[in-house]
């Protein structure tokens, strides 16, 4: 079944833009002028998930790229990375649930919990041009929180 | 506050053209989803389509072909451009505010636009 | 493509009644349900979404339930202001959204 999908970029609370940081890693960092044409495109997509009562799932792929943010158990700990797909197959309403995030959206913030890993966060360091990762904790020191932009093409 | 305003409303023979405009204030469009929804007098609302960024715009299946959304988020503006107009196209238009990306529910809508198709 | 069916279409009933107006969906839709309210010349207002949850400024007479393909819409105390069109939404069907008819509520 066809999917609603999106062309967007996401910068954290604090400004920072989401950037590519080798094939298989997004960092993020403060961009300016025309460095901010080195932000990811990110195709959101609505896909099926649990029922709850306002968290809406998504999964992040890379515009144009057959990449997808997926979570997964490495060495015992909830990892994010960018994983291969074949393009012919996504996106789709039925995502396998390392590709799902329950995008939580309060006072045009976001959030974007793994569902995968329930209350683990897409998250950014306060430190620039570190990796963007999956975080287990909300309201600490790692920025969880996201503003996102439509992207005209 | 936040206010949705449609304009571009009016009698319009069959066959012909118009485009319905929705202007926002209190909140910017660069990441907010619309849709325009319409009614027929006396009956129920039928939605027509939504646009997210400029290049993802989805509609019902009767819209497609004829009916056209865009945006130009400099003048935090919607569009709703429609051809081939039928006696049956006959309505109120509103735009609306998704009320969260992909939520699917509208949670600000616009007074309406009437269009009336006829000769 | 999903088709929204509310029933009944036509209900009449006095202040202070409860009043409960369902909607069926051709297949299930999880809880991806909306309710309207909209009055004669008006826009609709956002009365419930994800089948339960009340929408801001909705007063607690409002409720909503149901999951999958049975959903419903209670007024548990029917107030003057009340007597409008209401209708039902699927929100998360694919790339389109379909409304049920509508239910009028009148006065008996």
């Known amino acids: 079944a066809p999917v609603r999908s999106l062309n967007c970029t996401l910068r954290d609370s604090q400004q920072k833009s989401l950037v590519m940081s080798g094939p298989y890693e997004l960092k993020a960092l403060h961009l300016q002028g025309q460095d901010m044409e080195q932000q990811v495109v990110f195709s959101m997509s609505f896909v099926q998930g649990e029922e709850s009562n306002d968290k809406i799932p998504v999964a992040l792929g890379l515009k144009e790229k057959n990449l997808y943010l997926s979570c997964v158990l490495k060495d015992d700990k909830p990892t994010l990375q960018l994983e291969s797909v074949d393009p012919k197959n996504y996106p789709k309403k039925k995502m396998e649930k390392r590709f799902v995030f329950n995008k939580i959206e309060i006072n045009n913030k976001l959030e974007f919990e793994s569902a995968q890993f329930p209350n683990w966060y897409i998250s950014t360091s306060q430190a620039e041009n570190m990796p963007v990762f999956l975080g287990g904790t909300k309201g600490g020191q790692d920025i969880t929180d996201f503003t996102m932009q439509f992207v005209s093409s | 506050e936040v206010q949705l305003v449609e304009s571009g409303g009016g009698l319009v023979q069959p066959g012909g053209s118009l485009r319905l405009s929705c202007t926002a204030s209190g909140f910017s469009l660069s990441s907010a989803a619309m849709a325009w929804v319409r009614q027929a007098p006396g009956k129920g609302l039928e939605w027509v389509g939504i646009?997210?960024?400029?290049?993802?715009?989805y509609y019902a299946s009767w819209a497609k072909g004829r009916f056209t959304i865009s945006r130009d988020t400099s003048k935090n503006t919607v569009y709703l451009q429609m051809n081939s107009l039928r006696a049956e196209d006959t309505a109120v238009y509103y735009c609306?505010?998704?009320?969260?990306?992909?939520?699917?529910?509208?949670?600000?809508w616009g007074q309406g636009t009437l269009v009336t198709v006829s000769s | 493509e999903i088709v929204m069916t509310q029933s009944p279409s036509t209900l009449s009933a006095s202040v202070g009644d409860r009043v409960i107006i369902t909607c069926q969906a051709s297949?299930?839709?999880?809880?991806?349900l909306s309710w309207y309210q909209q009055k004669p010349g008006k826009a609709p207002k956002l009365l419930i979404y994800r089948a339960s949850t009340l929408a801001s400024g909705v007063p607690s007479r409002f409720s909503g339930s149901g999951s999958g393909a049975e959903f419903t819409l209670t007024i548990s105390s029917l107030q003057p202001d009340d007597f409008a069109t209401y209708y039902c939404q699927n929100t998360g069907g694919g790339v389109s959204i379909a409304f049920g008819q509508g239910t009028k509520l009148t006065v008996l």
């Open positions: 297949q299930s839709i999880d809880n991806w």
């Open positions: 646009i997210y960024d400029s290049a993802s715009t």
């Open positions: 609306a505010r998704e009320r969260q990306i992909f939520s699917g529910d509208m949670a600000g």
